[in-house]
């Protein structure tokens, strides 16, 4: 009764198509699969960035897989062939592992790469990234930003740089069609007559770095003798009302400060007859239903009401 064996996949490699971190893992079927013609062979693929604690594991019948990686670090992957139990009249048979690695050979000392990279997707409309030059680099150093997301044919270079002292220190992006809810890859590299510059790679999703405009049209309405309803409107732009969380700061008579977080565009405040003045500001942020993270907007303009004038509906800016 001979033991059933299967070879690992052939020609296992990680291919970099130039998408700044989105890589192809590909392989060929193992040798000597003739005995298993009636069988659907599967492959178990494990991969990770070097230094990561955990492997991502995929089982597939395909000869390729694609995923995003952090190109600041190396990548390691391994794959083996799986013969399901139906093919072997018994238990599943696994080949030995085929292994491969990939990394971009660095150049430049780490200090030369850009510092404090910061990207904000303003009002879910305009992406702006800014950075500081690397430590110890001369003014002849220039940084260039490239970006890619699924839907673009190839990585694009920034065409509208923000400059300081002749150096690129940021990028204003053009309109980015169908670019949210997918990984957005950036590489900032550089050149200098003086010394080589280390490249930096960044990956994020645009909906997670949105900074909305502040809410507008703040108003007061007396609900009852001891309740005032605060209302505001969502700012102009593409973000739907269901995507907002709000933070309100209310000041009564220059003393009491109330802070509250709410999910819609109203807040009811209990007041006393003694309240002489009420002021509030609101800011907004994209909520957990629309993103995993976000940036608070600036505070709105302050809206104030002085008690005795409430019946006349006088609202003071």
């Amino acid at each position: 009764d001979t033991e059933i064996k299967v070879n690992p996949p052939q020609d296992f490699e990680i291919v970099d198509p130039g998408y700044l971190g989105y890589l192809y893992l590909q392989w060929q079927p193992p040798l000597s699969l003739d005995h298993f013609k009636e069988c659907t062979v599967e492959y178990e693929l494990k991969y990770r960035n070097i230094g990561s604690e955990t492997w991502k594991t995929i089982i597939t019948k395909n000869l390729h897989y694609k995923d995003g990686f952090d190109l600041n670090k190396g990548i390691e992957a391994k794959i083996h062939t799986l013969l399901p139990w139906q093919c072997t009249n018994g238990s599943e048979v696994q080949s030995s592992w085929a292994e491969t690695t990939y990394w971009i050979s660095p150049q430049g000392i780490p200090e030369t790469k850009v510092q404090d990279m910061d990207c904000v997707y303003y009002n879910w409309q305009y992406l702006l990234c800014s950075w500081k030059p690397g430590i110890g680099v001369l003014l002849d150093t220039n940084y260039n930003l490239f970006y890619w997301y699924e839907g673009l044919d190839h990585a694009l270079q920034c065409v509208d740089y923000i400059k300081a002292d002749g150096q690129n220190i940021g990028c204003r992006f053009p309109y980015l069609e169908a670019s949210d809810y997918k990984d957005f890859y950036i590489c900032v590299n550089g050149s200098s007559e003086n010394k080589p510059i280390r490249s930096s790679y960044f990956t994020f999703q645009l909906q997670n770095i949105v900074k909305p405009l502040p809410p507008v049209y703040l108003t007061f309405t007396r609900e009852s003798s001891c309740e005032i309803k605060l209302k505001w409107s969502i700012p102009l732009g593409p973000i739907p009302a269901r995507c907002f969380d709000y933070e309100i700061e209310i000041r009564e008579d220059d003393t009491t400060l109330v802070t509250a977080t709410v999910e819609n565009e109203t807040y009811t405040l209990k007041t006393t007859n003694e309240t002489r003045q009420l002021c509030f500001v609101v800011r907004s942020k994209v909520n957990i239903y629309c993103s995993d993270d976000g940036i608070w907007s600036e505070w709105s303009d302050k809206q104030c009401w002085e008690g005795e004038d409430l019946s006349k509906k006088t609202l003071l800016r």
């Epitope: 070097i50 230094g51 670090k73 190396g74 990394w103 050979s105 660095p106 150049q107 430049g108 000392i109 780490p110 200090e111 030369t112 430590i135 110890g136 010394k195 080589p196």
Partner: antibody, heavy 116, light 108 residues
């Protein structure tokens, strides 16, 4: 197996020149950077410079004007050209492979003695 | 330049002792770029610990590293005869790359 072998050291007079070689095997200089590091007798380690896989170079600025690092990818070899040598350049010179921003393999070193 | 100051510069210890070597950087160094090397007389340095706390291939688990910012530590939990050597910390963060002055671990 990764190996680095330095050669070219010896006795040289002050003001003279010397060219050290580092023959690499088990990896390609087109994929890995290689550093030169020196150690004066009884002293600590001093970084001289690095030739990156892509061909660019970083130097210790204190030595930059007199020392030049080059490589020959076809021969998988790295070189350190040292000019205007001084007594204080007397040291064992090591080449070391760069891997993930550390020096993971070192050669056995070659001794350079600058003396009249 | 970032100065790397090791202490002590030498120490005498017995087999089985716990040994701690400290390395202080004159400027903050990312933990990713702080490494430790071991050098025995007449031999080349050997990478011992990379990125502050990761053991290089083949290094026994009695070696460990820790720290952040400007203060880093190498610890040998139970000194073995083959551990008598000189140890160097190294910063790979800023140019020029620099090493500590070394700590020589001798047999008591």
């Amino acid at each position: 197996e990764v190996q680095l072998v330095e050669s070219g050291g010896g006795l040289v007079q002050p003001g003279g020149s010397l060219r050290l070689s580092c023959a690499a095997s088990g990896f390609s200089l087109t994929k890995y950077g290689v550093h030169w590091v020196r150690q004066a007798p009884g002293k600590g380690l001093e970084w001289v410079g690095v030739k990156w896989a892509g061909g660019s170079t970083d130097y210790n600025s204190a030595l930059m004007s007199r020392f030049t690092i080059s490589k020959d990818n076809a021969k998988n070899s790295l070189y350190l050209q040292m000019n205007s040598l001084r007594a204080e350049d007397t040291a064992v010179y090591y080449c070391a492979r760069d891997h993930r921003d550390a020096m993971d393999y070192w050669g056995q070193g070659t001794l350079v003695t600058v003396s009249s | 330049d970032i100065q790397m100051t090791q202490s002590p510069s030498s120490l005498s210890a017995s087999v089985g002792d716990r040994v701690t070597i400290t390395c202080t950087a004159s400027l903050s160094v990312s933990s990713t770029y702080l490494h430790w090397y071991q050098q025995k007389p007449g031999k080349a340095p050997k990478l011992l610990i990379y990125s502050t706390s990761n053991l290089a291939s083949g290094v026994p688990s009695r070696f460990s590293g820790s720290g952040s910012g400007t203060d880093f530590t190498l610890t040998i939990s139970s000194l073995q005869p083959e551990d008598f050597a000189t140890y160097y910390c190294h910063q790979y963060h800023r140019s020029p790359l620099t090493f500590g002055g070394g700590t020589k671990v001798e047999i008591k």
